[in-house]
Interface confidence: medium
Amino acid sequence: QPDAINAPVTCCYNFTNRKISVQRLASYRRITSSKCPKEAVIFKTIVAKEICADPKQKWVQDSMDHLDKQIQTPKP
């Protein structure tokens, strides 16, 4: 079974319990499928590792917000 730090991941069964600095993150996707045991966010890191995270946690929401803004305002 996939755990909090496993790749590739379709469903998440455990969440990472440690914040990940956004500079290590490349993208994210939300998991809302009824086939999965829980709603989740899967972050893909810059080294292509996929990490399951709890969308209810502040740091996860912040990271998604940050990545969204980074796409809108790329580095000059």
């Epitope: 914040k19 990940i20 600095s21 956004v22 500079q23 502040k58 740091w59 929401q61 912040d62 990271s63 917000d65 940050h66 803004k69 305002t73 580095k75």
Partner: antibody, heavy 120, light 107 residues
Framework: QVQLVESGGGLVQPGGSLRLSCAAS????????MSWVRQAPGKGLEWVSN????????YYADSVKGRFTISRDNSKNTLYLQMNSLRAEDTAVYYC?????????????WGQGTLVTVSS | DIELTQPPSVSVAPGQTARISCSGD??????VYWYQQKPGQAPVLVIY???NRPSGIPERFSGSNSGNTATLTISGTQAEDEADYYC??????????FGGGTKLTVL
């Protein structure tokens, strides 16, 4: 133990320039983001600028944007702040501080600060 | 940037509980950090991620954050706790915002 030592402060005339340095030791400098925070005499703390651990992104307070430039040399374990077009309101103690995560920029270690005085 | 508001001063008798508030719009959705600064010294982190204590910080320091208000609580306040206290938060684009600071006086 973690040590951050600022230098380069002093008296400068309005419109002048100054370059602050912060020498880091006791930790893996290249793994941490770094910041400058200032404190005007008798006033509160004001965040000035951040730079990511690899130097890839920089962020500035609106009050210094376009005048100040943050940079780092990971081979020398040193953080810099180039301050141009200085104004009287830039007078403050300037602290360098480290942080681990972005965007949760909080400062677990601080230097003792260097005083910048802008006056004619 | 997020605007953080603190009371300018709080007084407490030794041994009593001091509470310092920090308010801002939807602050509970962000992590809040607290620093202690004594005269002539650099700030020291006393609470991170709302309610966590760094190693070396006494257990009498605690934090909470919900709604629009974060609170630093010092239980059994001691004379050595007299200092300025600053709350701090951040934005998604990695800027940091500080509250105006609160001077804690131990009577």
């Amino acid at each position: 133990q973690v040590q951050l030592v600022e230098s380069g402060g002093g008296l400068v005339q309005p419109g002048g320039s100054l370059r602050l340095s912060c020498a880091a030791s006791g930790f893996t400098f290249r793994s941490y983001g770094m910041s400058w925070v200032r404190q005007a005499p008798g006033k509160g703390l004001e965040w000035v600028s951040n730079i990511r651990s690899d130097g890839s992104y920089t962020y500035y307070a609106d009050s210094v944007k376009g005048r100040f430039t943050i940079s780092r040399d990971n081979s020398k374990n040193t953080l810099y702040l180039q301050m141009n077009s200085l104004r009287a309101e830039d007078t403050a103690v300037y602290y360098c501080a480290r942080f681990e995560f972005t965007p949760w920029t909080y400062f677990d270690f601080w230097g003792q600060g260097t005083l910048v005085t802008v006056s004619s | 940037d997020i605007e953080l508001t603190q009371p300018p001063s709080v007084s407490v008798a030794p041994g009593q509980t001091a509470r310092i508030s920090c308010s801002g719009d939807n602050l509970g959705k962000k992590y809040v950090y607290w620093y202690q600064q004594k005269p002539g010294q650099a700030p020291v982190l006393v609470i991170y991620d709302d309610d966590n204590r760094p190693s070396g910080i006494p257990e009498r320091f605690s934090g909470s954050n919900s709604g629009n208000t974060a609170t630093l609580t010092i239980s059994g306040t001691q004379a050595e706790d007299e200092a300025d206290y600053y709350c701090q938060s951040y934005t998604a684009q990695s800027s940091a915002s500080f509250g105006g600071g609160t001077k804690l006086t131990v009577l």
